[in-house]
């Protein structure tokens, strides 16, 4: 059957021979109705991209360098499997690059000029292109030939493979810059013994090279890594620490149309019959004809990657910068030590309308990127469309995931002058009722309930996660009989009470009308049975202070708030009634970016923050009339954070371990992609 | 809500001018910030330009050194120059107000800008 075939792309006779016998063995363990291989010959892995774009061919696997080059246009191929490596209980999928130096010098990344340079090899990924990619518009001008740009920067190098007579500099510390094992720097080893002998100040390896070298913790501990951020690090920090993260091995589809979970089930059922040791006439991972056919030999099964990660997340924000500016030779005309316009991330059309306004009152100092989920703008974040948003607690846990980090906090009870140096503790998570309800904390079985949206603090984690720990199990949808959880699956019964209008019904934007703090409360006044909120909401949209036609006329005690205790108390008592208290609301930026926010945002509230009086004819950042437009509305100041600066210490332990327990019952496909 | 009425569209060769005005009815003197939108079929709206009371303005990276937003508080409008005109200009244009901070989702008819030689 067509439909159930997969083409598989070979690249030269021998990789087409094994992809042959690959089709006949898969023959013989297959059910008729199951997937089945058709091979395809190529002459190069890019005829083999360009052969999947153009549906003449369904998967190959390639190399990092070339997933990049099946992700751009027009060929828009993605990752959907995986190799991995090492034990099935600890998979290692990718290796970071990193610089290793001795621990008794002294420099940083930024100070790298005239350093002697150890490297496994002239376009290598770890040793070369990641590095030079990386320092690339640091390199002396011109930049072509760039073998000659890097000769000029570095003070002295070992380059294998480079040739030695046009940059004797890239040969300095190993005359002739052989190619083969014969040089004794050549390849990671190597490249490491050039540093440890002292030729070279600095070694561009993976990560794993340090403990393949030195068994002996400490003779590791004589050496430090050096991360982009000009600080340093353990060798065991790897993770926290490395030039980029790299992809080993990877097969490719199309994004759309592209057969995934076909191919998934094809070498799901391969690795299970003809993986590591499991069959004597045919082995995916060995071949007689050859080494690394149609995947790597010391590949020890596949992973398949998550639906949510797109080839820009699969490569990285370090590792596409660095091939980019490798491959395109473009640098900024403004000098890398100036801070360019920030770009935030806006949800939908409301939020992208007041940062247009916050981009002309800024002259440009903020520009707009737009986003239709906020996973949809952190990944935005990620890869670099976008540099900052302002996110609810459970989304910086999210964020804080994916490798962003919090660069200012929200503060809404610190007045100013000291509100930008103040740490706050935080708001209370509340559940409110309508007065006139007979409910509890412990009767909310079989009631509607309106949520802010999943994955959020007040409107999620912390009323699920206290429910969790009482049903032990993640069925929501089944506890309520209804309700509106903006983001939940659109056929759930918590999307039932969710307003729209219709293509927005559930979705987790301002285009939902029962999204946020205000649309829970207003899904209360209108529907539900108990809304998860802060502890101000119930105020600010009471009394006349929220002029919209469902809000103007409500009665603040016409509301209370649910105990966990059982009882009930006026909306006036949070920090006696209260669900958990609440990480503020918090910024955050990619680490290479964070500086630059920070400094902007800064200058920013200056100019348009709380200290602005009139609104209603100036430009005010944080007032969108009850809407919580880009900032909460009640934010007076955005504060440093001092030591908090990664997402756990800004977190809190308690908060962190609660979101991480509810993680078993997580339908958030960014963090499944982020922590593949 | 201020009522907004665009005007000044119409058919131009690639190199051309245009001079978009935007009336108010009521007055945009208390109106911090007045913007020029522009949507092409099949495409998002995007802001092209915008001004504030003060002066200050900002520009899409597309129409830099093209096109100048100025405003006439006596006359309640606002104004956008568009020199040099290319192909991919071809949208209809929008002015907004961003004077409600519901930040709402009314538009005006607009004016229809084709540039085609």
């Known amino acids: 059957v067509p439909e159930k075939s997969v083409r598989w792309c070979a690249v030269s006779e021998h990789e087409a021979t094994k992809c042959q016998s690959f089709r006949d063995h898969m023959k013989s363990v297959l059910p008729s109705n199951g997937p089945s291989v058709a091979c395809v010959k190529k002459a190069s892995h890019l005829d083999c991209i360009r052969a999947i774009a153009a549906n003449e061919a369904d998967a190959v696997t390639l190399d990092a360098g070339l997933v990049y080059d099946a992700y751009l246009a027009p060929n828009n191929l993605k990752p959907v499997v995986a190799e991995f490596y090492g034990s099935k209980e600890d998979p290692q999928t990718f290796y970071y690059a990193v610089a290793v130096v001795k621990k008794d010098s002294d420099f940083q990344m930024n100070q790298l000029r005239g350093r002697k340079s150890c490297h496994t090899g002239l376009g290598r990924s770890a040793g070369w292109n990641i590095p030079i990619g990386l320092l690339y518009c640091d390199l002396p001008e011109p930049r072509k030939p760039l073998e000659k740009a890097v000769a000029n920067f570095f003070s002295g190098s070992c380059v294998p493979c480079a040739d030695g007579t046009d940059f004797p500099q890239l040969c300095q510390l190993c005359p002739g810059c052989g190619c083969s094992t014969l040089n004794q720097y050549f390849s990671y080893s190597g490249a490491f013994k050039c540093l440890k002998d002292g030729a070279g100040d600095v070694a561009f390896v993976k990560h794993s090279t340090i403990f393949e070298n030195l068994a002996n913790k400490a003779d590791r501990d004589q050496y430090e890594l050096l991360c982009l951020d000009n600080t340093r690090k353990s060798v065991d920090e790897y993770k926290d620490c490395h030039l980029a993260r790299v992809p080993s091995h990877t097969v490719v589809a199309r994004s759309v149309g592209g057969k995934e979970d076909l191919i998934w089930e094809l070498l799901n059922q391969a690795q299970e019959h003809f993986g590591k040791d499991k069959s004597k006439e045919f082995q995916l991972f060995s071949s007689p004809h050859g080494k690394d056919l149609l995947f790597k030999d010391s590949a020890h099964g596949f992973l398949k990657v998550p639906p949510r990660m797109d080839a820009k997340m699969y490569l990285g924000y370090e590792y596409i910068t660095a091939i980019r500016n490798l491959r395109e030779g473009t640098c900024p005309e403004a000098p890398t030590d100036e801070c360019k316009p920030v770009k935030w991330c806006a949800l939908s059309h409301h939020e992208r309308l007041k940062c247009d306004e916050w981009s002309v009152n800024s002259a440009g100092k903020i520009e707009c990127e737009s986003a239709e989920t906020t996973e949809d703008c952190i990944a935005k974040i990620m890869n670099g469309e976008a540099d900052a948003m302002s996110l609810d607690g459970g989304f910086v846990y999210i964020a804080g995931m994916c490798g962003l980090v919090p660069v200012l906090a929200e503060n809404y009870n610190t007045p100013n002058p000291n509100c930008e140096n103040t740490a706050e503790e935080g708001y209370f998570a509340v559940a409110v009722v309508k007065s006139s309800s007979d409910l509890t904390w412990d009767n909310l079985k079989g009631k509607k309930s309106c949520h802010t949206a999943v994955g959020r603090t007040a409107g999620w984690n912390i009323p699920m996660g206290l429910l969790y720990s009482k049903i032990n199990h993640c069925r929501f949808d089944e506890f309520f009989s209804e309700g509106c959880a903006p983001g939940s699956e659109k056929n759930s019964s918590l999307c039932k009470l969710c307003m729209g209008p219709s293509p927005n019904l559930c979705e987790p934007n301002n285009k939902e009308g029962y999204y946020g703090y205000t649309g829970a409360f207003r899904c209360l006044v209108e529907k539900g049975d108990v809304a998860f909120v802060k502890h101000q909401t119930v105020p600010q949209n009471t009394g006349g202070k929220n002029p919209d036609a469902w809000a103007k006329n409500l009665k603040e005690e016409d509301y209370e708030l649910l105990c966990l205790d059982g009882s009930r108390k006026s909306v006036q008592e949070p920090a006696n009634c209260h669900l958990a208290r609440a990480p503020n609301h918090a910024v955050v930026a990619r680490k290479d970016k964070a500086d630059c926010v920070q400094t902007l945002l800064l200058d920013q509230q200056r100019m348009f923050g709380s200290s602005v009086t009139d609104c209603s004819s100036n430009f005010c950042l944080f007032e969108s009339k009850t809407k919580d437009l880009l900032f909460r509305d009640d934010t007076v100041c955005l504060a440093k954070l001092h030591d908090r600066n990664t997402y756990e210490k800004y977190l809190g332990e308690e908060y962190v371990k609660a979101v991480t327990n509810l993680r078993k019952c997580s339908t958030s496909p960014l963090l499944e992609a982020c922590t593949f | 809500q201020v009522q907004l009425v665009e005007s000044g569209g119409g058919l131009v060769q690639p190199g051309g001018s245009l001079r978009l005005s935007c009336a108010a009815s009521?007055?945009?003197?208390?109106?911090?910030?007045m913007g020029w939108y522009r949507q092409a079929p099949g495409k998002q709206r995007e802001l092209v330009a915008g001004?504030?009371?003060?002066?200050?303005?900002n520009y899409a990276n597309s129409v830099k050194g093209r096109f100048t937003i100025s405003r006439d508080n006596a006359k309640n409008t606002v104004y956008l120059q568009m020199n040099s005109l290319k192909p991919e200009d071809t949208a209809v244009y929008y002015c907004?107000?961003?004077?409600?901070?519901?930040?709402?989702?009314?538009w005006g008819q607009g004016t229809q800008v084709t540039v085609s030689s």
């Open positions: 907004t107000d961003y004077s409600s901070r519901y930040y709402h989702d009314y």
């Open positions: 009521g007055s945009i003197f208390s109106i911090n910030t």
């Open positions: 001004i504030t009371r003060g002066g200050t303005t």
